[in-house]
Amino acid sequence: MACPLEKALDVMVSTFHKYSGKEGDKFKLNKSELKELLTRELPSFLGKRTDEAAFQKLMSNLDSNRDNEVDFQEYCVFLSCIAMMCNEFFEGFPDKQPRKK
Amino acid sequence: MACPLEKALDVMVSTFHKYSGKEGDKFKLNKSELKELLTRELPSFLGKRTDEAAFQKLMSNLDSNRDNEVDFQEYCVFLSCIAMMCNEFFEGFPDKQPRKK
């Protein structure tokens, strides 16, 4: 059976394609696909920030090659940023660490 | 209940701390901690590459700030690279796509 971390990586990949496969380039997320992915798969991250300008800003920030779409590499950078935010929260609670050094 | 992608991000964070918390700086992976993480959590990625030279090379590649340890950001870059490799494999099998465009 796959280990949790291997499963996590598989989820990252399959979630991307679940939405990138809906319209246009099937290996990229356009704005509406990104919006749907965020709303359905990352509701905790999104919170109440569902206004159009917020989505446009996020899309722009992720779209490093400026093609109006988010490719898998750009998506990975995004997930890494969220993971780093989660990690900062995690590191702020040392009692939650699995073991002290 | 957390969505699969949110769970995946949580696993990324908790797996890092499960090993970084063993010795030295509790927010970084030293070489032995990295080796243990890879062996136990990413056996499919590692395969048979368990020789010392391979580990040294991988450690060197991940350690972008050259402090002989892998911090959370460097670990995220590493996981993104693995995810991108998985994605290339995934994209190579169009019949596995959730939907054609």
Partner: antibody, heavy 120, light 107 residues
């Protein structure tokens, strides 16, 4: 109201490096925008040079890439352009612009432009 | 690079006329087409983005349409302040490229 102001020498000798700075005022020099350089040749044609944006991400026009360098100083609300080994063909009005985050990333604010002449 | 071709390169019109300028891209730019107006000695100003969306403060007599490779800028009733040069620009991919411009002159 966002304002952009280009500054730098108006005359550059051939083979030297053209250096320009753009100062942004009226809006914080935020990560939400990309900051561009565009030039307009005497014949009125417009050419995109490059931009700098989120996380310091930089994209250059491939036709100029090997001569081009862009940077930014967020503490001064400035970004700059260096174009090396200039020739008379680089004579143009140079504009700095802000690229909006809306669909198609239009250039919504422009500096007034600065004429750079390459001549000995 | 995506080539942008504008036509006509210049036109003469009178106040009140309906004016149409076309822009053709060398490949599909998926509606990521922006239009600018430039007056002599001034910087270009954004008019429309994403084919048909009016930039803030731009009069409603300006409109845009098109898809794929072919796009149009229309001025429904030309005003004295509209005599200028108009440029299209694709925002689909890098490097960004512009059309050669259309100069609208007084007849």
């Amino acid at each position: 109201q966002v304002q952009l102001q280009e500054s730098g020498p108006g005359l550059v000798k051939p083979s030297q490096t053209l250096s320009l700075t753009c100062t942004v005022s009226g809006d914080s020099f935020t990560n939400d925008y990309y900051w561009n350089w565009i030039r307009q040749f005497p014949g009125k044609g417009l050419e995109w040079i490059g931009h700098i944006g989120y996380g310091g991400n930089i994209n250059y026009n491939p036709s100029l890439k090997n001569r081009l360098s862009m940077s930014r100083d967020t503490s001064k609300n400035q970004f700059s352009l260096k174009l090396s080994s200039v020739t008379a063909a680089d004579t143009a009005v140079y504009y700095c612009t802000r690229e909006s985050f809306y669909d198609g990333y239009p250039f919504d604010y422009w500096g007034q432009g600065t004429l750079v002449t390459v001549s000995s | 690079d995506i080539q942008m071709t504008q036509s006509p390169s210049s036109l003469s019109a009178s106040v009140g006329d309906r004016v149409t300028i076309t822009c053709r891209a060398s490949q599909d730019i998926r509606n990521y087409l922006n239009w600018y107006q430039q007056k002599p000695g001034k910087a270009p100003k954004l008019l429309l983005y994403y084919t048909s969306r009016l930039h803030s403060g731009v009069p409603s007599r300006f409109s845009g349409s098109g898809s794929g490779t072919d796009y149009t800028l229309t001025i429904s009733s030309l005003q004295p302040e509209d005599f200028a040069t108009y440029y299209c620009q694709q925002g689909n991919s890098l490097p960004r490229t512009f059309g050669g411009g259309t100069k609208v002159e007084i007849k």
